[in-house]
């Protein structure tokens, strides 16, 4: 009779957990049986992030450090089942920890919006479009941001309106602006659980224009028109 290695109950093992689980939480378990009925000892291999520990007797797997989906998911480690006594034969399977995203990244502007301008004086109210993003994973739909002005004092001069889940329009409420830079604060809410807000600043310059660009003395670059 040839001694056989332990046999895992499944081809691979997977578990889904929220990335913000408390340290010490049971995140999964593996099981194997030995054909000869010997006891089995479980161990982990390749836990490069140092996130997990396994109970050598039960095969239960616990978190031992904070988990971070942005580091890569699923997180894959090898599980080894070794027979205790006998020939100490072992088998290898895999445990995949699927990290479900927690809303932990506030919204931000999708790109650099320096250089926005309107030609002064305004002949009619103007507007510009901007885009928001964040670094969270949006599994079942794209982001659904809402937009508002960052302070009440801005409401006399500006209004912000949502175009879709990622884009909004910033518009002037009148034409009586000074020839200078205005910093418009925008509040972006991601509607997540928990909801996170980012306050971003859009610098908008009102300037004299030459051929559709901000006039600048020699040595200054022209701004780009976004109106």
């Amino acid at each position: 009779d040839v001694n056989e290695a332990p046999q895992f109950s499944q081809h691979v093992f997977q578990a889904k957990v929220s990335e913000d689980v408390a340290i010490g939480t049971k995140v999964g378990n593996v099981t194997a049986k030995d054909p000869e009925g010997l006891d089995i000892s479980y161990s982990l291999r390749g836990d490069t992030r140092g996130w997990l520990k396994i109970d050598h007797v039960t095969g239960e797997i616990f978190s031992v450090a904070p988990l971070d989906r942005e580091a890569g998911s699923p997180y894959r480690v090898q599980v080894v089942a070794t027979e205790v006594g006998g020939s100490s034969l072992s088998s290898v399977s895999e445990f995949h920890l699927i990290l479900m995203d927690v809303n932990d990244n506030p919204p931000r502007l999708a790109k650099d919006y320096t250089g926005l301008f309107f030609c002064h004086p305004l002949s009619a109210p103007g507007s510009l479009i901007f885009e928001a993003t964040d670094d969270d994973q949006h599994l079942f739909r794209g982001p659904h941001f809402t937009f508002s002005l960052g302070s009440g004092s801005l409401q006399n001069d500006w209004e912000v309106s949502k175009i879709n889940g990622t884009h909004a329009r910033l518009s002037t409420r009148h034409t009586e602006f000074e020839e200078r830079e205005y910093v418009v604060l925008i509040r972006i809410n991601d509607g997540g659980r928990p909801p996170l807000e980012g306050i971003v600043s859009l610098p908008v310059t009102f300037c004299s224009c030459v051929e559709g660009s901000c006039f600048r003395p020699a040595g200054h670059k022209h701004h780009h028109h976004h109106h």
Epitope: S9, H11, V12, Q14, P74, S91, V92, E94, H96, L139
Partner: antibody
């Protein structure tokens, strides 16, 4: 980037053997199991087995157990699948695929035609 | 062996339509399920794993649901590039098996 490049099409006579290769690049070869599937004309995908390149452990579908051999060459990051005693119903496209939860990367496929 | 039964075997739909494909396992596979898209002459592409988790780079119009023995792939708004064959596959234990596939065609 991860790539699995398979050997070219083969035409074989019934009773012969075929050996298909799958060269991996762009990742740590020994760290992922490699599976083989096949798809006969007008049929679905059929799993043939897998090899763990780090240990050379193999597990085969019972249907092919007596005819299939999977091997791995770590020095060239290549896995091989040899199927013997070929018959006409073995005519199919054979795929290697890297294992994760499901198969996240596949080779381009190798057409094996068995015809007298 | 665990049998995977996919339905429908073929489906005609238009761009913009919402489409649902179902997959039933002959026993509980505890969400050890993947979905693939396969176009002629190309390698299959992994769409979802663990029944509901979208593979990196796959558009969010694809989603998965289900548990136990019954699973669903949904495409919320069909795009021209989505016309292909779709397969489910379990990886609960060997032998791994696939559904027979659903051919999604343009109406």
């Amino acid at each position: 980037q991860v790539q699995l490049v398979q050997s070219g099409a083969e035409v074989k006579k019934p009773g012969a053997s075929v050996k298909v290769s799958c060269k991996a690049s762009g990742y740590s070869f020994s760290s992922y199991w490699m599976h083989w599937m096949r798809q006969a004309p007008g049929q679905g995908q059929e799993w043939m087995g897998y090899i763990n390149p780090s240990t050379d452990y193999t597990e085969y579908n019972q249907k092919f157990k007596d005819r299939v051999t999977m091997t791995a060459d770590k020095s060239t990051s290549t896995v091989y699948m040899e199927l013997s005693s070929l018959r006409s119903e073995d005519t199919a496209v054979y795929y290697c695929a890297r294992s994760r939860l499901g198969f996240d990367y596949w080779g381009q496929g190798t057409l094996v035609t068995v015809s007298s | 062996d665990i049998q995977m039964t996919q339905s429908p075997s073929s489906l005609s739909a238009s761009v913009g339509d919402r489409v649902t494909i179902t997959c039933r396992a002959s026993e509980n596979i505890d969400s050890y399920l993947a979905w693939y898209q396969h176009k002629p002459g190309k390698a299959p592409k992994l769409l979802l794993y663990a029944a509901t988790v979208l593979e990196s780079g796959v558009p969010s119009r694809f989603s998965g649901s289900g548990s136990g023995t019954d699973y669903t792939l949904t495409i919320s708004s069909l795009q021209p590039e989505d016309f292909a064959r779709y397969y489910c596959q379990h990886y609960y234990r060997t032998p791994l098996t696939f559904g027979q596939g659903t051919k999604l065609e343009i109406k």
